[in-house]
């Protein structure tokens, strides 16, 4: 019998390399059975995850998964950092792994680096 626990499918140590000025959607895939849980996004500040209030969020429904989306319209340099989603389910809090946004400020980049160039940056490799 399949578990009816809520599960949040963000990979551990995942990241996204994005550009300031672009729109971006950060997705939290949520698996649940009967009732969709309340889901929130927070941004890590040291060991504390600060809840993101008043941000544009939305739900997207697919066959056996829902996605709670945090919208960046557009991405700002200050959006750089690690984010986590959490679900409130049966008065328990289920937390996802954190995922990191590496924001390149296009003003300081002469051209957009490739994925391999992004991966070659020491701050990316060892963060």
């Amino acid at each position: 019998k399949e578990s009816c626990d809520v599960q949040l499918y963000i990979k551990r140590q995942s990241y996204h390399s994005i550009f300031a000025g672009d729109p971006f959607k950060l997705e939290c895939p949520v698996k649940y059975c009967a009732h969709r849980p309340q889901v929130t996004w927070c941004k890590l500040n040291g060991t504390t995850c600060v809840k993101l209030e008043g941000r544009h969020t939305s739900w997207k429904q697919e066959k056996n998964l829902s996605f709670f989306i945090l919208h960046f319209e557009p991405v700002l340099p200050s959006d750089n950092g690690s984010y986590r989603c959490s679900a409130n389910f049966l008065s328990a809090i289920i937390e996802s792994h954190s995922t990191t946004l590496y924001v390149t400020d296009v003003k300081s980049a002469s051209e957009r680096p490739s994925k391999d160039e992004m991966a070659s940056r020491p701050w990316l490799l060892y963060s």
């Epitope: 551990r12 140590q13 995942s14 996204h16 994925k115 992004m118 991966a119």
Partner: antibody, heavy 119, light 112 residues
Amino acid sequence: QVQLVQSGAEVKKPGSSVKVSCKASGVNIKDTYMYWVRQAPGQGLEWIGRIDPANGYARYAQKFQGRATITADESTSTAYMELSSLRSEDTAVYYCAVYDGYYESFDVWGQGTLVTVSS
Amino acid sequence: DIVMTQSPDSLAVSLGERATINCKSSQSLLDSDGKTYLNWLQQKPGQSPKRLIYLVSKLDSGVPDRFSGSGSGTDFTLTISSVQAEDLAVYYCWQGTLFPRTFGQGTKLEIK
């Protein structure tokens, strides 16, 4: 069950490149990380790097940065590791492995590919 | 990089006896999520490595329960409670907490 099948043994000249493939079955590779490790004859294990097949982002050990390129093709469930500027010290068995990106609930290794670098 | 140091480099154990392999990391493997990403691999002669234990003490499916893992922070142990002939192998610890991933040098288990 999850299985990995790697390409066959290769003999290469110093200075050339080699590209090893690793085909996964029994899993949606979008839900995994795929990584590469090598083992020189009679030696221990050395981590080369890993890729997130969901978005193509790769991370590398500093030693292999700029010389190794890891890619993945989601449509064929295949990961690739290309190593350039080969030297004799690169003679080793190259293993690919795959693990569950969410809960680490599985970790499966391929059979290995022997790459011999010799003039 | 995190340095993983195993001891001993090799050990010979009689069938049915206990074998203990130690692994020490140069810094704590406790991740920010509260978990410790320390794995143990077994590599039998002429074969690919196979994960036995993950998250310090969780056994992979199909792994006999004579294998167990323990430890925290920087000090970890793999124990085989009653060594069998098929346990002849090299055992590696490796960490999945920080990049780059790093392995211990391996411990060769021989049967007396």
